[in-house]
Interface confidence: low
Amino acid sequence: APRGTQAEESPFVGNPGNITGARGLTGTLRCQLQVQGEPPEVHWLRDGQILELADSTQTQVPLGEDEQDDWIVVSQLRITSLQLSDTGQYQCLVFLGHQTFVSQPGYVGLEGLPYFLEEPEDRTVAANTPFNLSCQAQGPPEPVDLLWLQDAVPLATAPGHGPQRSLHVPGLNKTSSFSCEAHNAKGVTTSRTATITVLPQQPRNLHLVSRQPTELEVAWTPGLSGIYPLTHCTLQAVLSDDGMGIQAGEPDPPEEPLTSQASVPPHQLRLGSLHPHTPYHIRVACTSSQGPSSWTHWLPVETPEGVPLGPPENISATRNGSQAFVHWQEPRAPLQGTLLGYRLAYQGQDTPEVLMDIGLRQEVTLELQGDGSVSNLTVCVAAYTAAGDGPWSLPVPLEAWRPGQAQPVHQLVKEPSTPAFSWPWW
């Protein structure tokens, strides 16, 4: 710190006093000097460091009519809302000619009720799950001892005997309040009261019970929920593209999920109105009167394939002698899976039914046995997926080919000598 020289007497006729008070106090430090000639600018030091942004005012009063006469200079430093950072040794400093003069020191101290640097915060925790709360207070005067309270009941016999800055709670089964008291020689300050809301634990073991093409039955194990019974569980399902990238930690799915509520128990739910042969991701959360648990991680599931829901459309069957030409279009109804092909069955009035697998073609030419005199020949077609056959079309009678009708050339399919198996006729 700058030092005054001994060559000249100090100009200070009034030195800063002392201030001791509680946080938030407003006070003023003053120093006064008498100088000859032009009044100097007064600076303030705290602990030897110049206060560049000090809230100070300077008043100058001439003691004579001549500018070279003596002046009284008063500098006042205002401290608003006293904080710990304001404490220390204060001095005034002036430059007079080539000399530096420093006043005698004054002291600013802080003493009062404890002040909280950190208080317990409201939070939600899962039932029976450890967590910790923080509380930190300081004086002066030190020491500051803390006493934690749960639901207004002290957790130790006396301040300073229990947990101090951090309270470890091994788990709660009901929503509780926590606060801490800070004690020092001046008295007691009480922190805010934090409400710790006990939510159900995250459900576990989310799994599939059964699968249908348009519905999935899922079950899970509920977590503990403390003294609060679960009111319901909420299940979300979302279509999962290959690139959607739902991962365990990802907070939200990319599109609006399908949400269903399940009353509990049982901890089971049938999710309907799903697309067949489609991958989904599902998750579940359970709710008590205190609020919902966290979601489980997303679980990838898939609906199985179903059979086509309708028969092939626009079936036409024409006959020319010993050949029959049949063609059709894909079913308009949902296929519920990957179309693997078509089955065709034909039968005459007094002949056994013949069943054929046509594959994915939508037309076929049949080579009929005999002289073509089989009467009342009818044809039915069904589409199939890996899950099985869809419904058969209504029997379509074979119409005689009329000259002028185009007869496309098609690969001939020989009728098998005996049916592979019999199909119920309509």
Epitope: N128, P130, N132, P170, G171, L224, A248, G249
Partner: antibody, heavy 117, light 107 residues
Framework: EVNLVESGGGLVQPGGSLKLSCATS????????MYWVRQTPEKRLEWVAY????????YYPDTVKGRFTISRDNAKNTLYLQMSRLKSEDTAMYYC??????????WGQGTSVTVSS | DIVMTQSHKFMSTSVGDRVSITCKAS??????VAWYQQKPGQSPKLLIY???TRHTGVPDRFTGSGSGTDYTLTISSVQAEDLALYYC?????????FGSGTKLEIK
């Protein structure tokens, strides 16, 4: 001074059983959740079980679920691990440890379990 | 299960050096990460919990940092007695899982 001392390890045949104990001192045992952790011969650490301070809640990983049972006697300040249907992959050094903000702040010196025919 | 990956099985350093041991979680573990030191022939000892809180009695040359999935244990000035295996552990979700360990060797 916090002290945890495991015992009960040894050589056992596959399918056999063993009961480990962990005697504790130097802290209020009934205030703390406790763990069993094992360290394989390859030095890999695996959490085996944990139990709440009152003993009402226990948790196990799938690797030991249904075969191992953690328990405690707060009057005796002792933690136990009953191991049954032991497999060769259960061969390890078994440590008991005290829970501190979900981390393990004090560990015992360990007891060795060898499952071999 | 959450997988904790310590990509360096071994790290070689000299006394006085600064060294950082890393650990990556397979998902966000919200700073619920602890670090342990295991010296030869001893049981593991807790160094850091909640990613950055130093356990009682641990020298201040050990610091922990990180968030989300990436965590680091830093020894600001390695001492000869720091020769040990260092493990990370997530205590975010059961089953609590450990990294496979990083062996710190002194040159």
């Amino acid at each position: 001074e916090v002290n945890l001392v495991e015992s009960g390890g040894g050589l056992v045949q596959p399918g056999g059983s063993l009961k480990l104990s962990c005697a504790t001192s130097g802290f209020t045992f009934s205030d703390y959740y406790m763990y069993w952790v094992r360290q394989t011969p390859e030095k890999r650490l695996e959490w085996v079980a944990y139990i709440s301070n009152g003993g009402g809640s226990t948790y196990y990983p799938d690797t030991v679920k249904g075969r191992f049972t953690i328990s405690r006697d707060n009057a005796k300040n002792t933690l136990y691990l009953q191991m049954s249907r032991l497999k060769s992959e259960d061969t390890a050094m078994y440590y008991c440890a005290r829970l501190h903000f979900y981390a393990m702040d004090y560990w015992g010196q360990g007891t060795s379990v060898t499952v071999s025919s | 299960d959450i997988v904790m990956t310590q990509s360096h099985k071994f790290m070689s350093t000299s006394v006085g050096d600064r060294v950082s041991i890393t650990c990556k979680a397979s998902q966000d573990v919200s700073t619920a990460v602890a670090w342990y030191q295991q010296k030869p022939g001893q049981s593991p000892k807790l160094l850091i919990y909640w990613a950055s809180t130093r356990h009682t009695g641990v020298p201040d040359r050990f610091t922990g940092s990180g968030s989300g999935t990436d965590y680091t244990l830093t020894i600001s000035s390695v001492q000869a007695e720091d020769l040990a295996l260092y493990y990370c552990q997530q205590h975010y979700n059961t089953p609590f899982t450990f990294g496979s360990g990083t062996k710190l060797e002194i040159k």
